[in-house]
């Protein structure tokens, strides 16, 4: 049985192979039970965690993980050398930087060691699964009386990242957001000096070096402007 799994991680060609034993008519064989899906994320191209929901197993099972790279020099099957655990049961595998090869098809195989025929294989494009660290060192510069420029740093090559800037004043119900490309500069042309502004940024490994859908965590916020701004009309509404 060859089943295509559609996952929300940009790996449209992900496939899983489930190897089944013959199913007895009177009972369900253990080897017919589907294995949990493996989810992998590459953190800042420093390490990768491939995890699965170990609690989905009918009984506690130390599933094993093997991996290789399809059609490449790295096509030798490798055993996981650093398992992650949840309540003393394997629930993931951590791979170090030297084991991560973006742009080659990563094949990951989960197996039940007690039922070797019970295994599932997935193929992943790791460049679509990179999550960078959150932007750091946010700074604001006043370009003119009413114009602010926001700058920040990333712990990755700038040209591989795109960014989302959000800002709001103490008067706003919701954030205003703007996409920013690899140049990672944002300016706000019209700033009200009577209001206090909050800015935050997140980054994504897209579109140059990968096609990741997942954003980094938000940066720590940075603030600008009057702490003693005019009374917030929404506060009055809440207090009324």
């Amino acid at each position: 049985l060859n089943t295509t799994i559609l996952t929300p991680n940009g790996n449209e060609d992900t496939t899983a192979d489930f190897f089944l034993t013959t199913m007895p008519t009177d009972s369900l064989s253990v080897s017919t039970l589907p294995l949990p899906e493996v989810q992998c994320f590459v953190f800042n191209v420093e390490y990768m965690n491939c995890t699965w929901n170990s609690s989905s197993e009918p009984q506690p099972t130390n599933l094993t993980l093997h991996y290789w790279y399809k059609n490449s020099d790295n096509d030798k099957v490798q055993k996981c050398s650093h398992y992650l655990f949840s309540e003393e049961i394997t629930s993931g595998c951590q791979l170090q930087k030297k084991e991560i090869h973006l742009y080659q098809t990563f094949v990951v195989q989960l197996q039940d060691p007690r039922e070797p025929r019970r295994q599932a294989t997935q193929m992943l494009k790791l460049q679509n699964l990179v999550i960078p660290w959150a932007p750091e060192n946010l700074t604001l510069h006043k370009l003119s009386e009413s114009q602010l420029e926001l700058n920040w740093n990333n712990r990755f090559l700038n040209h591989c990242l795109e960014h989302l800037v959000q800002y709001r004043t103490d008067w706003d119900h919701s954030w205003t957001e703007q996409s920013v490309d690899y140049r990672h500069k944002f300016s706000l042309p019209s700033v009200d000096g009577q209001k206090r502004y909050t800015f935050r940024v997140r980054s994504r490994f897209n579109p140059l070096c990968g096609s990741a859908q997942h954003w980094s965590e938000w940066s720590h916020p940075i603030h600008w402007g009057s702490n003693t701004s005019k009374e917030n009309p929404f506060l009055f509404a809440l207090e009324a």
Epitope: V45, N71, L102, Y103, Q104, L157, H159, C160, P207, L208, C209
Partner: nanobody
Framework: QVQLQESGGGSVQAGGSLRLSCAAS????????MTWARQAPGKGLEWVST????????AYAASVEGRFTISRDNAKSTLYLQLNSLKTEDTAMYYC??????????PGQGTQVTVSS
């Protein structure tokens, strides 16, 4: 093994143009972003430009933006860099490299660009 062969460099007057090429082999060229970098005499390696694997996205160092254009032909496994409005400060050895330009793997042999005033 991975092979990258740059060509197209030369000597040119300021304001002139050149087109650099990089012929790649030994890997799945169309799967990788590709990068141009350069090294001026007595200086470190400087990132110049990167292009996505499908050619749909590009990025440039501020010092070359608007003057240089990166492109690729996946059918020919070849990377290009069009250099226009050359300045004396563009004088350097130009290298192409597989990937996004993180310094690994090492680039090819390079092609020399010399711009005189």
């Amino acid at each position: 093994q991975v092979q990258l062969q740059e060509s197209g460099g030369g000597s040119v007057q300021a304001g002139g143009s050149l087109r650099l090429s990089c012929a790649a082999s030994g890997f799945s060229f169309s799967s990788y972003p590709m990068t141009w970098a350069r090294q001026a005499p007595g200086k470190g390696l400087e990132w110049v430009s990167t292009i996505a694997s499908d050619g749909g996205s590009t990025a440039y160092a501020a010092s070359v933006e608007g003057r240089f254009t990166i492109s690729r032909d996946n059918a020919k496994s070849t990377l290009y860099l069009q250099l226009n409005s050359l300045k004396t400060e563009d004088t350097a050895m130009y290298y192409c490299t597989k990937g996004y330009g993180d310094g690994t793997p090492a680039p090819g042999q390079g092609t020399q660009v010399t711009v005189s005033s």
